[in-house]
């Protein structure tokens, strides 16, 4: 995701209200949650904490030599976490899903 | 990676010469290869071919409503391929790695 060029790739808070994105029509609770986001740049040299793939390292080195040829690697979620939600099923019955996968960022990295 | 806003997230060619990135000091062959890159935007609605995670969908919806609050999801490699390389060991002996992982983009997606 986008981020200030001055900061390196990291996880930051992103409060999401389900009403804002139109999901309140089927998600009863929670009303909002922290999805987090991955923000910041993938600068040379890529640190171990951004768990770069070999391709990300190669792309970073190419960008360093030819900035107009290719962009930097991108700071993205590399591991996601589930949240628990109470939602309305097809018949409008409130149903609990303990593990609604991939909703929140657990880790960010350069890809 | 970066990309023209007019095109959607896709895999494009990126020829990498190992001499350009300083890896010719240990990689004997190949001299160059296609690393590919992921280029283009992650626009609403995210298509199935960019295999969006739930988090990417949420982030896209938040960006749609509050463009300054959070950026769009990013077009990145979601699957990488290996290449075979011939490299010099510490003693300068040419050695083959049949399956040098994560060097080339196989698939791109919005994350």
């Amino acid at each position: 995701s986008t981020g200030a060029a001055s900061s390196h790739c990291q996880k930051t808070s992103l409060r999401v209200n389900f009403e804002d994105i139109g999901w309140d029509s089927w998600i009863i609770a929670p009303k909002e949650y922290d999805a987090y986001e991955c923000k910041g740049g993938c600068f040379f040299p890529l640190a171990d904490d951004v768990t770069p793939t070999k391709h990300a390292i190669v792309q970073t080195l190419v960008h360093l030599k030819f900035p107009t040829k290719v962009g930097k690697a991108c700071c993205v979620p590399t591991k996601l976490s589930p949240i628990s939600i109470l939602y309305k099923d097809d018949m409008g019955v409130p149903t609990l899903k303990y593990h609604y996968e991939g909703m929140s960022v657990a880790e960010c990295g350069c890809r | 990676s970066t990309g023209a806003a007019s095109s959607h997230c896709q895999k494009t060619s990126l020829r990498v010469n190992f001499e350009d990135i300083g890896w010719d000091s240990w990689i004997i062959a190949p001299k160059e290869y296609d690393a590919y890159e992921c280029k283009g935007g992650c626009f609403f609605p995210l298509a199935d071919d960019v295999t969006p995670t739930k988090h990417a969908i949420v982030q896209t919806l938040v960006h749609l409503k509050f463009p300054t609050k959070v950026g769009k999801a990013c077009c990145v490699p979601t699957k990488l391929s290996p290449i075979s390389i011939l490299y010099k060991d510490d003693m300068g002996v040419p050695t083959l790695k049949y399956h040098y992982e994560g060097m080339s983009v196989a698939e791109c997606g919005c994350r």
Epitope: - | A29, P30, K31, Y33, D34, S81, P82, I83, S84, L86, D89, D90, M91, V93, P94, T95, L96, K97, Y98, H99
Partner: antibody, heavy 114, light 110 residues
Amino acid sequence: EVQLVESGGGLVKPGGSLRLSCAASGFTFSNAWMSWVRQAPGKGLEWVGRIKSKTEGGDTDYAAPVKGRFTISRDDSKNTLYLQMNSLKTEDTAVYYCTTGTYWGQGTLVTVSS
Amino acid sequence: QSVLTQPPSASGTPGQRVTISCSVTNTDIDIFNVHWYQQLPGTAPKLLFFHDYRPSGVSDRFSGSKSGTSASLAIVGLQSEDEGYYYCAGLDEAMRGPVFGGGTKLTVLG
């Protein structure tokens, strides 16, 4: 000079076991990814499996016909590669080569027969 | 049936040019990674060509090329000592290791 010397081949009954060794010299063995490749009598080359260097996790991968029966290991202090072969079948009869991909040993013959 | 298809045999007279082909018939194999081995009678295989790299001791009479889904090994100025088997090898991504072609037996006539 790079040298790879296999040993441990011989005659074994179906269902039996055998351990092959490969003594390496002339290169940085500990950093090398090492493979075993076999060649049945009068046939072509067939990859058996590979072990990565310990610094890269020491992961092993195997060809489908030997998976679950063969195990590759290495002892970097002895510059030696091993291939433990269990539940041997007649179709495992072959000359077994250890290789870095660039350099190959002379091979050792394994015959599985009752 | 190998996923790398080679002709079972090839032949030529001394001094001639001979080409051995290797065709990829599996999407798990990228032609980019295909390389060549030589196995002379009664000896272990030897790396002949890897991309544009020819190991020391390998004659410059041997050269490799790739086009589409096919790789080729060319031998110019054929000599009797070139007689043996030639194998192409590629990286099988699914298998996570090399896969070999069936091999081509090269015979030097006369």
